[in-house]
């Protein structure tokens, strides 16, 4: 495992009187960003497979505005390196494509506009762990200067990042037959004995006794070429004899998405989110122009007519993605307010509002009690987005239409018995208690804890709660 690193040194007009003006203007300020795509470079098949080694996108560079009358200088660049991590062995020979993109920051309808300024490509031999290699390339009227290197991630070392280094077990020297790990002289090369019979061309190991396969090979000894035709199902055949890659425990293991696409698991398999310029189940289709009809779901394609010109899909409402291939789950943004139910009808969004709310997004709070009648003498109380009736005695329910059983809630305390009455309820209190709900104890000396009972009522008589 390791990282390919790309450093862009300059991007500007080539020499000579025909050099281009700046790609940015006072009217249209812009900024640059870069994309790198890496492929293993040995076989033609590998070279044709898009970005099989990985891809990366730089940050946006500083905003640049052309100074009228001044010659176009080298343009301001994004900070930092472009880094493409690789999981397996570094192939030694690789192909690259470096694209320079312009992001226009003028008053664009629908956000910034992107256009491809330049694309350079090449195939190079490069040993991991070596020094930075420099390059100068022309693309149209532009000149790009860059450096690149591949470096191993510890504990991997070596020109292909397949050897491992381990801390020394003894302070003075490495074990028998083992060399110090340059440049980490305080570490020793780990003894790596791959599984017996592991293909020296197509297999390697990072742990003794294992046999890991380079891309395009499978089987216990990496001797079986992968047959893509019988392996289209992400959980398809997995035996070595069928020549299919054995998938990991999850459908996104090993990232099946090419060209820097990102993988997300779905209930049945996986889904690739592709960068602009690529589409297909695994982002494997590239070199696309508007003539190829890359925009799905009625998206409008804008761009050049040849493979060197980028295209952009302007998606209709309800779709997104570089090729308008993804239906927007617009309800996930919870556009319906006040607890409204969201319905995505494809061509439009609908909100089904809760009582008391209205408007396209249920944003209007209605007068809850307007036009609402509470039956049987109940009174309407506003609040919480829905009307509520405060019912007269003996009635309940949302609109006070239901005759209530006043004794259902056992309102009489201390063993008092409840009697339903036309005007409410009456509690017959147990000896020693009094009050409308039998809530007060009667003192032994006959005095009540409360003011004297109303005339005509003796303690112990059923108290009527009016």
């Amino acid at each position: 495992a390791g990282v390919f690193e790309l450093q862009i040194h300059s991007f500007g007009p080539g020499p000579g009187p025909g050099a281009p003006r700046s790609p940015c203007s006072a009217r249209l300020p812009c900024r640059l960003f870069f994309r790198v795509c890496l492929k293993p470079g040995l076989s033609e098949e590998a070279a044709e497979s898009p970005c099989a080694l990985g891809a990366a996108l730089s940050a946006r560079g500083p905003v640049y505005t052309e100074q009228p009358g001044a010659p176009a200088p080298d343009l301001p660049l994004p900070d930092g390196l472009l880094q493409v991590p690789f999981r397996d062995a570094w192939p030694g020979t690789f192909s690259f494509i470096i694209e320079t993109w312009r992001e226009e920051l003028g008053d664009q309808i629908g956000g910034p506009a992107w256009s491809l300024l330049a694309r350079v490509a090449g195939r190079r031999r490069l040993a991991a762990g070596g020094p930075w290699a420099r390059d100068i390339q022309r693309a149209g009227a532009w000149e790009l200067r860059f450096s690149y290197r591949a470096r191993c991630e510890p504990p991997a070392v070596g020109t292909a990042c397949t050897r491992l280094c381990r801390p020394r077990s003894a302070p003075s020297r490495c074990g028998p037959g083992l060399r110090p790990c340059a440049p980490l002289e305080d570490e020793c090369e780990a003894p790596l004995v791959c599984r017996a019979g592991c293909s020296p061309e197509h297999g390697f190991c990072e742990q003794p006794g294992e046999c890991r396969c380079l891309e395009g090979w499978t089987g216990p000894l990496c001797t079986v070429p992968v047959s893509t035709s019988s392996c289209l199902s992400p959980r398809g055949p997995s035996s070595a004899t069928t020549g299919c890659l054995v998938p990991g425990p999850g459908p996104c293991d090993g990232n099946p998405c090419a060209n820097g696409g990102s993988c997300s698991e779905t209930p049945r398999s996986f889904e690739c989110t592709c960068p602009r310029g690529f589409y297909g189940l695994r982002c494997e289709v590239s070199g696309v122009t508007c003539a190829d009809g890359p925009c799905f779901n009625g998206g409008l394609c804008v761009g050049g007519a040849d493979p060197d010109s980028a295209y952009i899909c302007h998606c209709p409402p309800g779709f997104q993605g570089s090729n308008c291939e993804k239906r927007v789950d617009r309800c996930s943004l919870q556009p319906c307010r006040n607890g409204g139910l969201c319905l995505d009808l494809g061509h439009a969004l609908r909100c089904r509002c809760r009582a008391g709310f209205a408007g396209p997004r249920c944003e209007h709070d209605l007068d809850d009690c307007a036009g609402r009648a509470c039956a049987n003498g109940g009174t309407c109380v506003e609040g919480g987005g829905a009307h509520r009736c405060s019912c007269a005695l003996g009635f309940g329910g949302r609109d006070c239409r239901e005759r209530a059983d006043p004794c259902a809630a056992r309102p009489c305390a201390h063993g008092g018995r409840c009697y339903a009455h036309f005007s409410g309820l009456v509690c017959a209190c147990a000896p020693g208690y009094m009050g409308a709900r039998c809530e007060f104890p009667v003192h032994p000396d006959g005095a009540s804890a409360l003011p004297a009972a109303p005339p005509g009522l003796r303690p112990g008589d059923p108290q009527r709660y009016l």
Epitope: E44, A121, R123, R124, D135, Q137, R138, D308
Partner: antibody, heavy 117, light 107 residues
Framework: QVQLQQSGAELAKPGASVKMSCKAS????????IHWIKQRPGQGLEWIGY????????EFNQNFKDKATLTADKSSTTASMQLSSLTSEDSAVYYC??????????WGQGTTLTVSS | DIQMTQSPASLAASVGETVAITCRAS??????LAWYQQKQGKSPQLLIY???SLEDGVPSRFSGSGSGTQYSLKINSMQPEDSATYFC?????????FGGGTKLEIK
């Protein structure tokens, strides 16, 4: 204007070595690489290698790895190529050219090497 | 190394005629193709780079096109001063390699 001025014709014996030069002017010498190209009489063109004057890094066509040595002197803005163990197969016109990896935009006038006993 | 096959090896054209020279690469070179003109006794001169970009100072009657493995150089309205040998060169891989050349003469 950009110019690459190459040294004069060379006559050498088989087994000997020869060193030819390429003086650059009219541009910043360290900004571009100097490539060397061989052309035998009535034949096509064959890339030998290049030197990056900034880093003095060199890269060669495998066919010339043991034949050519490339150097560059920033102070005199001059690139040089030494050819060793000469044989009659090395008789050719040798060009230096300014460029990057995918263009050679200015060429010297060429140095003719004749290897004869 | 990538092989470059140029055709025809030679041709003659009249003044004002349109001329086309083709170059085929042994594998995809991703537009990394340049065309050079070499007049008798002179050093080569860059005409076209990255398949279709015209070098500064080169007359607009010269144009380049192509993609993948097939590329061509076109001269619209041949002029006497266009008599020369034309070479294609791939720069996708190291070492860069040249075609065998096409000798263009005036009729």
């Amino acid at each position: 204007q950009v110019q690459l001025q190459q040294s004069g014709a060379e006559l050498a014996k088989p087994g000997a070595s020869v060193k030819m030069s390429c003086k650059a002017s009219g541009y910043t010498f360290t900004r571009y690489w100097i490539h060397w190209i061989k052309q035998r009489p009535g034949q096509g063109l064959e890339w030998i290698g290049y030197i990056n004057p900034t880093t003095v890094y060199t890269e060669f066509n495998q066919n010339f790895k043991d034949k050519a040595t490339l150097t560059a002197d920033k102070s005199s803005t001059t690139a040089s190529m030494q050819l060793s163990s000469l044989t009659s197969e090395d008789s050719a016109v040798y060009y230096c050219a300014r460029g990057g990896s995918n263009f050679f935009d200015y060429w010297g006038q060429g140095t003719t090497l004749t290897v004869s006993s | 190394d990538i092989q470059m096959t140029q055709s025809p090896a030679s041709l003659a054209a009249s003044v004002g005629e349109t001329v086309a020279i083709t170059c085929r690469a042994s594998e995809n070179i991703y537009y990394n193709l340049a065309w050079y003109q070499q007049k008798q006794g002179k050093s080569p001169q860059l005409l076209i780079y990255t398949a279709n970009s015209l070098e500064d100072g080169v007359p607009s009657r010269f144009s380049g096109s192509g993609s993948g493995t097939q590329y061509s150089l076109k001269i619209n309205s041949m002029q006497p001063e266009d008599s020369a040998t034309y070479f294609c060169k791939q720069a996708y891989d190291v070492p860069p390699t040249f075609g065998g050349g096409t000798k263009l003469e005036i009729k």
